[in-house]
Interface confidence: low
């Protein structure tokens, strides 16, 4: 496939009643559209038995399953039934294949792992495949930001990434917040940054043929505390259909420690805002950042009173900062083919 | 217009404690911050603690006052308390009662940047 390429199955016919099953190998980055049945009366799309939202990233609409830029988690098996029978129309798995091509940083597509690959001759030693993303060697960031260094590479067979720290094996467990390593991606990704994660940073791919190294000095500048950041757009406006689960995202970066609060913009008396001028809310969550998972807000089965104005609100020892998004609840598609078939519902 | 009647202040010993209480009163929101503030002589005005209306346990502190001063408020009595135990000679100053609403829909700021009213000091004396 070429990366301008998506995956389609055209046109948007009505298929035949005996459908094979199908595999489909999908890179990561690609964009997907599947037809199933007339897209006036197109089958209702699910996944692994959940049946898909019209609505989200992955989302199954008149017909169509599309997943805006697939995921290895969107990995698996599709059906298409007809609406209002249990007739299979499409039955498909799709399978995690390599990253397309692109500029965007995250994504080698040069450099994967190709397990058709692996022992076939002749055998090359490691090499990197994009040297010129390897140039800054020094890195002198902030205190508080994100950090990655990346080493792509290839070789055959296809060699395997290591980290050192200071020239000591570097797993990560001795900092707060640990480390990611994205071996597809050959990074090494950390978060919050601290003037004790300064050092030398030597990315070290071998195989049977051979090892390259390369070194990385990351220099960690102090700075001044500061009232929590929110990232911008976050969290972000968002449309589902009554019955699905919705996700809102609040992404805070603070040197003191954070408190933070999820509020639900309310009406009391037919007004959102009190005599003063200041909306009313309803506290949904609050707790702060050391919690699980308190940066997001969970929704499950969601209603049309759900719908409205949510805010984010993190607060520090130097300040506040609070950013908010819509709920926008849709009413569910196909009322009658809920009713047909009461265990699916909607996952998004 | 919101009027904060702050008292509790005194003279108390290095390792003596003291309450301060701020109430407020007038047109006052329900979506509020109200916290402390305080002013050493020759200094700049600087943040000590507060408190959300809707979060009754959670305070935020300055980092030199945390784990010796506790913040709480009574919405009912729109009342905020701030128990300072632990006193040290540099916690002297006075100390300013402080009211903030949020803006609409986001914002952010420094403590001070979110103050709408302030009320009059108490002092604060911790000497042997």
């Known amino acids: 496939l070429e990366a301008s390429e998506e995956v389609e199955l055209e046109p948007c016919l009505a298929p035949s009643l005996e459908q094979q099953e199908q595999e489909l190998t999908v890179a990561l980055g690609q964009p997907v559209r599947l037809c199933c049945g007339r897209a006036e009366r197109g089958g209702h799309w699910y996944k692994e038995g959940s049946r898909l939202a019209p609505a989200g990233r992955v989302r199954g609409w008149r017909g169509r399953l599309e997943i805006a830029s697939f995921l290895p988690e969107d990995a698996g098996r599709y059906l298409c039934l007809a609406r209002g029978s249990m007739i299979v129309l499409q039955n498909l798995t799709l399978i995690t294949g390599d990253s397309l091509t692109s500029s965007n940083d995250d994504e080698d597509p040069k450099s994967h792992r190709d397990p058709s690959n692996r022992h076939s001759y002749p055998q090359q030693a490691p090499y990197w495949t994009h040297p010129q993303r390897m140039e800054k060697k020094l890195h002198a960031v902030p205190a508080g930001n994100t950090v990655k260094f990346r080493c792509p590479a290839a070789g055959n067979p296809t060699p395997t990434i290591r980290w050192l720290k200071d020239g000591q094996a570097f797993h990560g467990e001795n900092r707060i917040g640990g480390i990611r390593l994205r071996h597809q991606h050959w990074s090494l990704v950390m978060e919050s940054v601290v003037p004790s994660d300064r050092g030398t940073y030597t990315c070290l791919v071998e195989n049977a043929v051979g090892s390259i190294r390369y070194n990385y000095l990351l220099d960690v500048l102090e700075r001044s505390p500061h009232r929590p950041i929110l990232q911008a757009g976050l969290p972000a406006n968002t449309t589902a259909v009554v019955g699905s689960d919705v996700e809102l995202l609040c992404k805070v970066y603070s040197d003191a420690q954070p408190h933070i609060q999820w509020l639900k913009h309310i009406v009391i008396n037919g007004s959102s805002f009190g005599a003063d001028g200041f909306p009313y809310v309803q506290v949904l969550k609050t707790a702060d950042i050391n919690s699980s998972e308190v940066e997001v807000l969970y929704l499950r089965n969601v209603s049309a009173e759900d719908a409205g104005e949510y805010t984010c609100l993190a607060g520090n020892s130097i300040g506040l900062s609070y950013q908010s998004a819509w709920l926008t609840v849709l009413p569910e598609e196909d009322p009658t083919w809920t009713a047909a078939a009461p265990e699916a519902r909607y996952t998004d | 217009e919101v009027q904060l009647q702050a008292s509790g202040g005194g003279f108390v010993q290095p390792g003596g404690s003291l309450r301060l209480s701020c109430a407020a009163s007038?047109?006052?929101?329900?979506?509020?911050?109200m916290g402390w503030f305080r002013q050493a002589p020759g200094k700049e005005r600087e943040f000590v603690s507060a408190i959300s209306s809707f979060s009754s346990k959670q305070g935020y502190y300055a980092d030199s006052v945390k784990g010796r001063f506790t913040i709480s408020r009574d919405n009912s009595k729109n009342t905020v308390y701030l128990q300072m135990n632990s006193l040290r000679a540099e916690d002297t100053a006075t100390y300013y009662c402080?009211?903030?609403?949020?803006?609409?829909?986001?914002?952010?700021?420094?403590?001070?940047?979110?103050?709408?009213?302030w009320g009059q000091g108490t002092q604060v004396t911790v000497s042997s």
């Open positions: 402080a009211y903030a609403s949020y803006p609409r829909h986001q914002g952010n700021g420094r403590w001070k940047d979110f103050v709408e009213y």
């Open positions: 007038g047109r006052t929101s329900w979506l509020t911050t």
